[in-house]
């Protein structure tokens, strides 16, 4: 049954639409988290200036974020289905522990934070069903994870911001272009 | 055939604990946000728990907050309800539902338990409390 009985009449269902596909749910899946990441950069650019800054460099010698490359066989010349869906679920394996750095980074965005990190974390499941090649998925090492952790939270207050400036820019840009890929898939 | 099915109702004693499930069949579960309601003879049907698709954050109406947990096993394509320390207001038949009201950042939590928002409804599993 559509509606249950008892339906009144300011409360009427939403009409049956065809249920979403993988692709499609995957792909607003994608696009909710990058909603949720321009909520985030919003109070980070509004609190300093690392928005602006030009020594983005200092910082990013700290970081190894995933970023997509041409073998990853993820853009339009030399895609690969198999080869791009294992580079995009390993990519966003290894943000998660940066994600989990910027759970404490936000003062007024502390929930849209988490929503991002756990959202990310429903992403890869979606992706999962998805793939065939499950076996060609690294997972990190949860010690390097700690570690990478404990270095990054030790960090000054200039390198602090500059880093969850650079984490929500990375993870932008990683999550457009798997964008861009899966709806290729 | 698209259709929700839920199961695990009965008969159960003041103070005691029940769970229901919610499978789907015909379309994914885990691609929609899933409404639990109810409804009591000659009462209208409210909405006592929902939970995220998007990001798995979860909403409770004041009247099963601290009693009710609702959760979601994404592997298995399930939803589930346990209800604790049951009341005999409690006594209704539940309804499982998936709408897509979590789609967008930032969206109404509370917005989950109205009814509007659900594009699939099962056919309910009756929950009853008394001794």
């Known amino acids: 049954a559509p509606v249950p009985p008892g339906e009144d009449s300011k409360d009427v269902a939403a009409p049956h639409r065809q249920p979403l596909t993988s692709s499609e749910r995957i792909d607003k899946q994608i696009r909710y988290i990058l909603d949720g990441i321009s909520a985030l950069r919003k109070e980070t650019c509004n609190k300093s200036n690392m928005c602006e800054s030009s020594k983005e460099a200092l910082a990013e010698n700290n970081l190894n974020l995933p970023k997509m490359a041409e073998k990853d066989g993820c853009f339009q010349s030399g895609f690969n289905e198999e080869t791009c869906l294992v580079k995009i679920i390993t990519g966003l394996l290894e943000f998660e522990v940066y994600l989990e750095y910027l759970q404490n980074r936000f003062e007024s965005s502390e929930e849209q934070a988490r929503a991002v990190q756990m959202s990310t974390k429903v992403l890869i499941q979606f992706l999962q069903k998805k793939a065939k090649n499950l076996d060609a998925i690294t997972t990190p090492d949860p010690t390097t994870n700690a570690s990478l952790l404990t270095k990054l939270q030790a960090q000054n207050q200039w390198l602090q911001d500059m880093t969850t400036h650079l984490i929500l820019r990375s993870f932008k840009e990683f999550l457009q272009s798997s964008l861009r890929a899966l709806r290729q898939m | 055939q698209v259709q929700l099915v839920e199961s695990g109702g009965g008969l159960v004693q003041p103070g005691g604990s029940l769970g229901l499930s919610c499978a789907a069949s015909g379309f994914t579960l885990a691609y929609y946000g899933i409404g639990w309601f109810r409804q009591a003879p000659g009462k209208e049907r409210e909405g006592v728990a929902c939970i995220s698709s998007s990001d798995l954050s979860t909403y409770y109406a004041d009247s099963v907050k601290g009693r009710f947990t609702i959760s979601r096993d994404n592997a298995k394509d399930t939803v589930y309800l346990q209800m604790n320390s049951l009341k005999p207001e409690d006594t209704a038949v539940y309804y499982c539902?998936?709408?897509?009201?979590?789609?967008?950042?930032?969206?109404?939590?509370?917005?989950?338990?109205?009814?509007?928002?659900?594009?699939?409804w099962g056919q309910g599993t009756q929950v009853t409390v008394s001794s």
């Open positions: 539902a998936a709408g897509t009201w979590d789609l967008k950042f930032g969206y109404s939590r509370s917005n989950c338990v109205r009814s509007y928002e659900y594009d699939y």
